[in-house]
Interface confidence: low
């Protein structure tokens, strides 16, 4: 006869091991005993459990309600055993000792290979901000046994680093996605993908990408100079920019405190019915935590009983500044 | 600004532990992000990394020593120590305790302590 | 482990003159490598990491290139100072190691 067993059992860390050792022999064998031991380089080998054919499972007590037999229905030749919630502890060697009536005895050693899945964690950089040169986005850490791939999924275009640290059982892999920081990126999801033979799907976790930026600004409402005419209802200014975090917006008339009736909404300047005195230079000031600018425009309400005057629809230069 | 200051016995008796604790100042071992490096320098010779240990407690070990080292983390105190057993003379040497910001960059050793000389002799 | 080589083990140079510094590893460390100055009675100084980035307050005569395998710290004036043992190391994977030195010394 022979044994039927594996060189290697894995299972992911938890789950039960089948460790096999099953007796193929002639219709007339029988087997007596099995018995398992933990083969341990140091310790040598270690008694698990002995399968007797008459007086059932004995497990040795380092082991006790650890170690069991499979399910019935059992072939009496089989003398697999259950691990019970492996642990990484539990990698390494394992021997099956068979005996058998009336060939004698066999042996079979296999390996247990404990998987450890990883549980990466995603940490981002600093914050980023438009103009900053290469620039960490986010490192991914991920530490299983064995030693787990981290990859980046992104439409960004960046750089990506690995360096691994090994662990007497496992090893940890940290993979540090590097970029340029623009703001096409922001909003841009950043991927770190674990793969790990002991999942059945790849792990990922999404960073969205916060690039910090502020636009130009610029006033639009003044595009068409017949409307700027005194009496005019429901004339506007609109202030444009873009940024992130959100810019906020402030209005201040360059010559003088803002006439009386003019209110401030957000972006938007709105006028009362126009009057000559609307007539000035309006200045735009747009900030957020990363920069700040103006522009400024000159606004001149045309008087209908004055025809030799025109609008002036100069757009004055734009500043910023950084904070 | 983060300072290591090596203590402990210059000398200590072949067959018995070197015990060595740096103290860090300037800055928390709990904040995270760093790990800390135990590094030693035996007389005209060059650097050898010893371990390095996490505020959490994860220990990494050279195995070389990793028969004989332990590094171990006290938050509250704001300090990790060395044990290293059964030395002999081949174990004199100047031991650093470092600092190493990982994983972000410049991700190697950036403060260093300033050494403490320890002299293996009865 | 991962074995890093510095050589010369001693180079000689007049200063003002350029140093050019090499360190070959046994396998490849990507670019997970640094240099330290050494000197003596002092703690090593970190000067490059990642193998071409100068750390904090490093002057700009230091420059470090390379990847995977071979590696080289250039100092390309060289000031009084300068003049100390010079350390590779990789810490690309456990253990952590650190080349032999080379001693820069005055011509």
């Known amino acids: 006869g022979e044994l039927e067993t594996s060189d290697v059992v894995t299972v992911v860390l938890g789950q039960d091991a089948k460790l096999p050792c099953f007796y193929r022999g002639d219709p007339d064998e029988q087997v007596g005993q099995v018995a398992w031991a933990r083969v341990d380089p140091n310790e040598g080998i270690r008694e698990l459990a002995l399968l007797h054919s008459k007086y059932g499972l004995h497990v040795n007590p380092a082991y006790e309600d650890r170690v069991e037999q499979p399910p019935p229905p059992r072939d009496p030749l089989d003398g697999s055993v259950l691990l019970r919630n492996a642990v990484q502890a539990d990698e390494g060697e394992y021997e099956c000792r068979v005996s058998t009536f009336p060939a004698g005895s066999f042996q079979a050693r296999m390996r247990l290979r404990v998987l450890v899945p990883p549980l990466p964690s995603l940490n981002p950089g600093p914050p980023l901000e438009e103009g900053q040169g290469l620039t960490l986005a986010a490192s991914c850490t991920a530490e299983g046994s064995p030693a787990p791939s981290v990859t980046w999924d992104t439409e960004v275009k960046g750089t990506q680093s690995s360096r691994s640290f090994t662990h007497p059982r496992s090893a940890a892999v940290t993979s540090e996605f590097h970029l340029v920081p623009s703001r096409s990126m922001n909003g841009q999801p950043l991927t770190c993908v674990v793969s790990h033979p002991g999942l059945l799907q790849d792990r990922r976790i999404t960073h969205t990408l916060q690039v910090a930026f502020l636009a130009e600004a610029s006033v639009r409402g003044l595009e068409d100079q017949n409307l700027w005419q005194v009496g005019r209802e429901g004339a506007t200014l609109k202030c444009l920019s873009e940024g992130q975090p959100p810019p906020k917006y402030n209005w201040t008339r360059l010559d003088g405190p803002l006439p009386s009736g003019v209110r401030v909404k957000g972006d938007t300047l709105g006028f009362p019915p126009l009057t000559t005195e609307h007539s000035g230079v309006y200045v735009c000031h747009v900030s957020n935590e990363l920069s700040s600018r103006d522009s400024q425009v000159t606004v001149e309400v045309l008087d209908p009983e004055d025809p030799g005057k025109q609008v002036d629809l100069v757009s004055a230069s734009h500043h910023h500044h950084h904070h | 600004q983060v300072q290591l200051q090596e203590s402990g016995p210059g000398l200590v008796k072949p067959s018995g532990t070197l015990s060595l604790t740096c103290t860090v100042s300037g800055g928390s071992i709990s904040s995270g992000g760093y790990y800390w490096a135990w590094i030693r320098q035996p007389p005209g010779k060059g650097l050898e990394w010893i371990g390095s240990i996490y505020y959490t407690g994860s220990t990494y070990y050279n195995p070389s020593l990793k028969s004989r080292v332990t590094i171990y983390v006290d938050t509250s105190k704001n300090q990790f120590s060395l044990k290293l057993s059964s030395v002999t003379a081949a174990d004199t040497a100047v031991y650093y305790c470092?600092?190493?910001?990982?994983?972000?960059?410049?991700?190697?050793?950036?403060?260093w302590g300033q050494g403490t000389m320890v002299t293996v002799s009865s | 482990e991962i074995v890093l080589t510095q050589s010369p083990a001693t180079l000689s140079v007049s200063p003002g003159e350029r140093a050019t510094l090499s360190c070959r590893a046994s396998?490849?460390?990507?670019?997970?490598l640094a240099w330290y100055q050494q000197k003596p009675g002092q703690a090593p100084r970190l000067l490059i990491y990642g193998a071409s980035s100068r750390a904090t307050g490093i002057p700009d005569r230091f420059s470090g290139s390379g990847s995977g395998t071979d590696f080289t710290l250039t100092i390309s004036r060289l000031e009084p100072e300068d003049f100390a043992v010079y350390y590779c190391h990789q810490y690309g994977s456990s253990p952590l190691t650190f080349g032999g030195g080379t001693k820069l010394e005055i011509k």
């Open positions: 470092a600092r190493d910001p990982f994983p972000e960059p410049p991700d190697a050793f950036d403060i």
């Open positions: 396998q490849s460390v990507s670019s997970n």
